[in-house]
Structure formats: C-alpha cells, structure tokens
C-alpha cells in the first residue's frame, strides 16, 4: 500500500501555494510593467541567451544534481522546479521594490529576470541540505525567507560597501551554503531505523545527478559573467571560469581516485568537485589576469572539494543530519570562502602595486562584507529552520524521509524505481 500524501498537507499545500500565487499575480498587476523601449533585436536575443543559460543551470543543472537519492529523485527534480518558479517571481518583485519602487512601478527587463533567476538559484543550492526531510509547503516558506534575506543582503551590501551587481551576487555561494546548513541544523536530525537505504544513491539517479553536474559545468561561465558591466569583464570572466572548471574536473576525478584505498572513483565526489573551480573563481573571475592563475585556483578548489567530500560528511551527518550525498552545502561554504579570500588577495596585490596605502581599509571592508553575508545567512537560516518546525506544515514523519511515494502517485507502486 502506498503511503498517501498526508491529509492535512493535501488541504494546506494547494491553499497555501495558490493563495501565494494569487497574491503574486495581484502584486504584478498593480506594481509592474515591462520595459517599453524598442531594443536592438540582436542585443535582445544575446541578453535572453544569458538568462536562458541561468535557467538551464537552475532547472536542469541543480534539479538533477540533487536527484541522486535512490527513492527521492522525482521529488528532488520537481521540487527544485517548483522552488525556482516561485523564487523567480518573488525575487523580481522584491528586487524591484528594493531598488526602483519610488517611481511607483517596477520595470521588468531581461536583466531583472536574470537577477531573479540568480537569486532563486541560492535557494536551490541551500535546499540540497534539507531535501527529503521537508514537504512542498515547507519549501515555499524557505523560498520566501531566503529570497527575501538575499535581496536585503544585496541591497545593504550595495549601499554600505558600494559593491556592484556582480560582487554582491557572488556572495550567493557562501550565503546559500550557510543558510542551508543552518536550516538543516534546526530540522529533526536522526535518520530513523529502516530509512538508511533511502538516503543511499542508486545508479540511475546518480547518472541523472551527473547529468545535472554536466549542465552546471557547461553553463557556469554564464553564471559568473552574467552581471558584469562591460564586454571585456564578461570575456575575462567566461575564460577564467572555463579554465577553472576544466582543471577542477581533472582534479576531481584523479583526486577522487587518489582518496580511495583501491583507487576507485566516487560518484559523489565527482558530482560536486567538477563545479569547484567555478565557485572558487566566482568573485574574482573578471579580475584574474591570466589563464594559469584560474587553472591553479581550479586545481586547489578541486582538491579542497574532494578532501571535504572525504572528511566532512561524517561530521555533517552527525551534527546537521545531512546525508553523505548532499555535500553541496559544505562544499560551497568552503569554496565560497576560498573565492572570497582570493578576491581579497588580488585586492591587496593591486593596492600594493598602486602604492596608495589603502590595504587595511580594503581588507577590513571585504571581511566586513563577507561576515555580514554569513551572519545574515545563519540568522535567516535559523529563523527558517524554526519556522519549518512548526506543526502547521505537517512535515513528513522521520520514517518517511527521502521517500518519493509520500509525495507522488506511482501507478505500479514500485519501490526501487
């Protein structure tokens, strides 16, 4: 007998989600309009392509990357899409309200959709730490809180630290990682007896997770270059990200083999480590002056990622209740920090070169900015975790963790699909 979607959630989820969608539609009706300018059509297509790359990364890349659980692959992919769709809508409104609302209307451009997709991507990174332990109603809450927190963080950083779009969006790695880890810390941790098999990876879902990793790998240069202000910077960002992810793939596969006593390659290590270079160069991808430096960073990031994947899951499983295959959270937290450190080092080298005696000031501001991102991520993550623990959401029972059958209708009730 298949376990039915809990009765209370069957009432709660559609009501909650559709009411929210109706509210969003009303907000769009009253407060938004499209950019009226007659753009150059070629430019419009080019601009749309970047947004399309980001959507592919989010929907296919992150959707499939989190689908490696034996009995939770359907939910991983579909819930990711649900969160992306909801997150983009709320992010567009929020960004408009925070940045351009005094004019009375929020103007929607392809750039604002690009920005919103990147904001929603933050949720998809964070959710890796909690997927399988929450239902859709809870994920709606998570989307709303995280997108709001990230939007406000970006506005505060922009105003206080005078950072541009690229710089304040590149905190997404660290922010999303710490947000997800703090939410996971609040949720019921122990995996009850009888569910150990469910958080294990299976061959076919693992293959789809690899497919997700491949899509992310292909489009990461678009992500790192999407918000830069000039074609020179975008070109540098694309090149440097490409070199970094290329090297991190080689490092991930060889490092994974090195880390295993029999020299075997771990699927889980490879899934996340192939992306390591892209995360590590994200903040400074437009500044790196030559390919070799990007490649060295890709190498270091790949090694850190494999090392982290080998030694951190035990700790994360015990303390945060995160399964071994959900390593995106701590991976991104380490690599995001690495990226921020690299940016500060480059800043210092530039300042020393210019001889303008501003090193202390710059380092202090950069550390302040990073600290603010981490603090807001942890605080909003803990708040979300506490909210998700409320009985109103009818969270899945621990015995139903990592189980597609709780949420999906399977005509033949197969267990090992």
């Amino acid at each position: 007998m298949s376990s039915k979607y809990p009765r209370s959630v069957r009432r709660c989820l559609p009501l909650w989600a559709l009411t929210l969608e109706a509210a969003l539609i009303l907000l769009f009706y009253f407060f938004t309009h499209y950019d009226a300018s007659l753009e150059d059509q070629k430019g419009l297509v080019a601009s749309y392509q970047v947004g399309q790359d980001l959507t592919v990364m989010a929907a296919i890349g992150l959707g499939f990357l989190t689908s490696s659980f034996r009995r939770h692959s359907w939910s991983s992919v579909a819930f990711n899409l649900f969160m992306l769709a909801l997150g983009v809508q709320w992010a567009i409104l929020l960004d408009g309200f925070l940045s351009q609302f005094p004019s009375g209307k929020v103007v929607i451009t392809l750039f604002s959709i690009r920005l919103a997709t990147m904001s929603a991507l933050s949720v998809l990174i964070s959710v890796d730490a909690v997927l399988g332990k929450v239902n859709l109603a809870q994920l709606v809450v998570m989307v709303l809180v995280e997108v709001t927190a990230l939007g406000n963080l970006r506005m505060v950083i922009s105003n206080i630290f005078n950072t541009d779009y690229h710089m304040n969006m590149m905190h997404i790695y660290v922010f999303a990682a710490y947000f997800g880890l703090s939410v996971a810390w609040c949720l019921p941790k122990p995996l009850p007896e009888g569910t150990e098999d469910k958080d294990q990876t299976a061959t076919i879902p693992s293959l789809s997770a690899m497919l997700g990793a491949l899509f992310l790998w292909m489009f990461w240069p678009s992500f790192n270059s999407a918000l830069l202000r000039s074609p020179i910077e975008r070109k540098n960002a694309v090149f440097n990200t490409y070199y970094a992810v290329a090297v991190s793939v080689v490092t991930a596969i060889s490092g994974s083999s090195l880390a295993h006593p029999q020299g075997k390659i771990s699927k889980t290590y490879v899934h996340s480590a192939v992306l390591a270079g892209g995360v590590a160069v994200g903040t400074s991808c437009h500044l790196i002056p030559s390919p070799w430096l990007a490649m060295v960073l890709g190498l270091v990031a790949g090694l850190i990622s494999v090392g982290g994947a080998k030694y951190l899951p035990g700790c994360c499983n015990r303390v945060l209740g995160i399964p071994h295959s959900s390593i995106m959270g701590y991976n991104f937290s380490l690599l995001g920090l690495l990226g921020e450190i690299i940016y500060i080092v480059l800043l210092v080298l530039d300042t020393v070169g210019a001889g303008n005696g501003m090193i202390g000031f710059q380092v202090l501001l950069s550390i302040g900015e990073l600290s603010l991102a981490i603090v807001i991520a942890l605080m909003s993550g803990l708040l979300t975790g506490l909210l998700l623990n409320l009985k109103i959401w009818k969270a899945p029972h621990e015995a139903k963790y990592f189980d597609d059958q709780v949420f999906w209708k399977f005509p033949h009730l197969a267990v090992g699909f």
């Epitope: 392809l110 480059l346 080298l349 710059q362």
Partner: antibody, heavy 129, light 112 residues
C-alpha cells in the same frame, strides 16, 4: 575621431512625447555604456539616465523615472531617449555622453567606471504650450 | 542621493594668477578600491561639457598640466596654477560613485 551627434529635439506641448537619438561613431559603440545628461537654460548639468553596453541594465534620475526610457540599437550605433508626459521643467539641452572606464589594476584586470568622458554637442528640447 | 556643493559660484581671476575651486559631497566618494569617484568638467560658453579631471586627481587626455585635482573622501579641490584667457568657463564637479550621478551647481570662472 570619437563623435556623438544628438538629434530629435524641438518644441513640444506639455503632456506630449518626443524621442531623442544619438548617433555614435569613431569607437566600438556596443562596448560602452551610454548616458543622457541635460542642462536647463541658465542652469547646471543634471544627469538623466544610463544604459549598459548590451542594453541589459538601466538607471534613471528620479525626475525621469516612469516617464523617460533609455534604449539603444547596437546594430545602428544609436542611443535613444523616449520622453513621455513632458513638462515645462523638462526644457533643456540634452547631451548624450559615453560611459567612462579606466583599467586600474596593476595585477588584475580591474575596470573602474567613473562617469562620462566624451559628450555630444546637444539637442534642444522646449516644452511649451 | 549624494549632494554636491561647489564654492565659490563665481570666481574672478587675473590672468596668470592661480585659481582654486572647492567641491564638497554629502557622502564620502572614496571607494573601497582606493579611488575617489569625483570628476571635474569644464563647459566653455556655447559648447558642450568636456572631461577635465577624473577619479579625483587624474588629468584627462589633452588637458594642460596647469590643471590639477586633489582631495579625498568628501572634500575636493580643482586648482589652476596660472589662469589663461581660454580658461573662462563653467566648472562642474560630479560624483560617479553611485546613481543617480550628481553635479555641483557650477563655478563661473571669469577674467578680471
């Protein structure tokens, strides 16, 4: 040499619309952000709007928000300013200007954007009934 | 918005004498990268503005070395070491740190 030529100005009644154009030559137009700046008769300079090199992002002065729209056609090397619901206080000489940046990093390839470096000769818009 | 205040608004100078124009901003224009996002523009009668000094102290190409910019944070100065007749113009400071970009009211330099 680098040149910006504005056109489209004229006399218009309050509440009506006008579209200004700025033709660029002598540089790779599609690689630069562009601005509109205006100067009311006998007054100082007032920044109106900026658009990124690919048209992706735009910013406006409070006085222009909701009424003016900056756009560009990179295939024609042309910048536009669509002005709707014009008011008497919009009477001014309108200049287009190129976004200025300098490569500053000795170690990195850091670009610093600081304002406008090249200006057009301006086109006059008079809003009067 | 960042408010830019120039002084004096009118500056009569004898040819060959030095001249100094002050510009103050309501917020610091010193960016974390160490640059001050302040530019000086001059506008000769009947002409469009042209860039004189950028990022606080850098002369634009073709600008004579008698023009110099200094200052940091909120207080900036444009100096002309020896005024010439052709320097008669309006001088504007502008902050390029954040949008909306804002200009000072302008200083009219005239020959005594």
């Amino acid at each position: 040499q680098v040149q910006l030529v504005e056109s489209g100005g004229g006399v218009v009644q309050p509440g009506r619309s006008l579209r200004l154009s700025c033709a660029a030559s002598g540089f790779t137009f599609s690689s630069y952000g562009m601005h509109w700046v205006r100067q009311a008769p006998g007054k100082g300079l007032e920044w109106v709007a900026v658009i990124w090199f690919d048209g992706g992002n735009k910013y406006y002065a409070d006085s222009a928000k909701g009424r003016f729209t900056i756009s560009r056609d990179n295939s024609k090397n042309t910048l536009y300013l669509q002005m709707n619901s014009l008011r008497a206080e919009d009477t001014a000489v309108y200049y287009c200007a190129r976004d200025a940046s300098v490569l500053s990093g000795l170690v990195t390839r850091r670009l610093v954007y600081y304002g406008m470096d090249v200006w057009g000769q301006g086109t006059t818009v008079t809003v009067s009934s | 918005d960042v408010v830019m205040t120039q002084s004096p608004l009118s500056l009569p100078v004898t040819p060959g004498e030095p001249a100094s124009i002050s510009c103050r901003s309501s917020q610091s224009l010193l960016h974390r990268n160490g640059y001050n996002y302040l530019n000086w523009y001059l506008q000769k009668p009947g002409q469009s503005p042209q860039l004189l000094i950028y990022l606080g102290s850098n002369r634009a190409s073709g600008v004579p070395d008698r023009f110099s910019g200094s200052g940091s944070g909120t207080d900036f100065t444009l100096k002309i070491s020896g005024v010439e007749a052709e320097d008669v113009a309006f001088y504007y400071c502008m902050q390029g740190l954040r949008t909306p970009y804002t200009f000072g009211q302008g200083t009219k330099l005239e020959i005594k």
